[in-house]
């Protein structure tokens, strides 16, 4: 004969534990039913009556099977620098994450407590390490032969264009300007002479390796919510 199924509440056998979705009530000394997610215990069990559950009120939730007398409060509404990626329901808390261009400076169990704007690398500096959901941009000075003329949280240092004849040498914040020694067509007087690169610049997606003479990591700026440092701007 199969063993009889015990209905809650029941006294567990000595040394045994209560079943899944049950808990041992210390006062009643019985195995009693838990409440399902989205509910809480309105009345705890006794020796003869099982747990009475009730739905969580608005703006409160329980995510797990439980016997808590009160549902948990959903977190406060997402701030202007955040987006709500999960709404508050009876079964789950609200989750706020940082909007594009921001990163999480102070995380919580789920989502973000405090967002901060991604650091922008000023001209002469490029992105050494891009920002992530939880880390700030790291800027580095553009190495010889590379430049960045933007204030950006995404732009890297790009190589100077290679000229046959250099009109203006490039520096960390400006590209080289080339001079055409043999114009392909006559120019009207006073016309602006556009630079004529010998070869098109390759589109790098990562910072170019620095020459061995240039220091590398010593230029990396600190991560995290720090005051704007050299090479970054708070804008």
């Amino acid at each position: 004969l199969p063993a009889q199924v015990a209905f809650t509440p029941y006294a567990p056998e000595p040394g045994s534990t209560c079943r899944l979705r049950e808990y041992y009530d210390q006062t009643a000394q019985m195995c009693c039913s838990k409440c399902s997610p989205g509910q809480h215990a309105k009345v705890f069990c006794t020796k003869t009556s099982d747990t009475v559950c009730d739905s969580c009120e608005d703006s409160t939730y329980t995510q797990l099977w439980n016997w808590v007398p009160e549902c948990l409060s959903c977190g406060s509404r997402c701030s202007s620098d955040q987006v709500e990626t999960q709404a508050c329901t009876r079964e789950q808390n609200r989750i706020c994450t940082c909007r594009p261009g921001w990163y999480c400076a102070l995380s919580k169990q789920e989502g973000c407590r405090l967002c901060a704007p991604l650091r922008k690398c000023r001209p002469g500096f490029g992105v050494a390490r891009p920002g992530t959901e939880t880390s700030d941009v790291v800027c580095k000075p553009c190495a010889p032969g590379t430049f960045s003329n933007t204030t950006s949280s995404t732009d890297i240092c790009r190589p100077h264009q290679i000229c046959n004849v250099v009109a203006i040498p490039g520096n960390a914040s400006m590209d080289a300007v080339c001079t055409s020694t043999s114009p392909t067509r006559s120019m009207a007087p006073g016309a602006v002479h556009l630079p004529q690169p010998v070869s098109t610049r390759s589109q790098h997606t990562q910072p170019t390796p620095e020459p061995s003479t240039a220091p590398s990591t010593s230029f990396l700026l600190p991560m995290g919510p720090s005051p704007p440092a050299e090479g970054s701007t708070g804008d």
């Epitope: 210390q26 009345v43 705890f44 009556s49």
Partner: antibody, heavy 119, light 106 residues
Framework: QVTLKESGPALVKPTQTLTLTCTFS??????????VGWIRQPPGKALEWLAH???????FYNPSLKSQLTISKDTSKNQVVLTMTNMDPVDTATYYC???????????WGQGTTVTVSS | DVQMTQSPSSLSASVGDRVTITCKAS??????IAWYQQKPGKAPKLLIH???TLQPGIPSRFSGSGSGTDFTFTISSLQPEDIATYYC????????FGGGTKVEIK
Amino acid sequence: QVTLKESGPALVKPTQTLTLTCTFSGFSLSTSGMGVGWIRQPPGKALEWLAHIWWDDDKFYNPSLKSQLTISKDTSKNQVVLTMTNMDPVDTATYYCARITGTRYFDYWGQGTTVTVSS
Amino acid sequence: DVQMTQSPSSLSASVGDRVTITCKASQDINKFIAWYQQKPGKAPKLLIHYTSTLQPGIPSRFSGSGSGTDFTFTISSLQPEDIATYYCLQYGNLWTFGGGTKVEIK
């Protein structure tokens, strides 16, 4: 409005049995989750839980006083009765009845009744 | 039986002071603790249940915290009407009161 009121003798002799009645209004012991309990407080001392009874007639007693205590209810009269046998002068105290919620804390209390045990 | 050790047994503080009372349970009681205020000759009055849930009508200067075995009750700014004895009650395993804390004004 929830109210509770204790009644019983002000004086009992040692070895006698004390019978206290709690008469309440504003709730019913036929409602799931409702309970009534008894707590006492000797003069100048702390509160001590004695016993209580639930809507489904489940009863709980303070383990150190269990042999002396009996609790019962009369749902139709809105009353709970506590009897305590073999009274001793150390049982001199103010006795309170209180409503207990479904999640087990005392929320409403009676005004208390003072019981002196003396020969 | 769960024992509740409440401290201090008495304290004297000035109006506006922050007052803190602690209760320590002899075993884990989750968050099942309530706090009561009792004035001389009166019945206890429920202030807080489930560690930190304030009863309706109770001023927000009263608060509670803790879980497991260590619990704290705080009056953020003591008022003359707060002069009373305060008791903790554990209800995680039967029911046990703490020994009480008598709060007086300096």
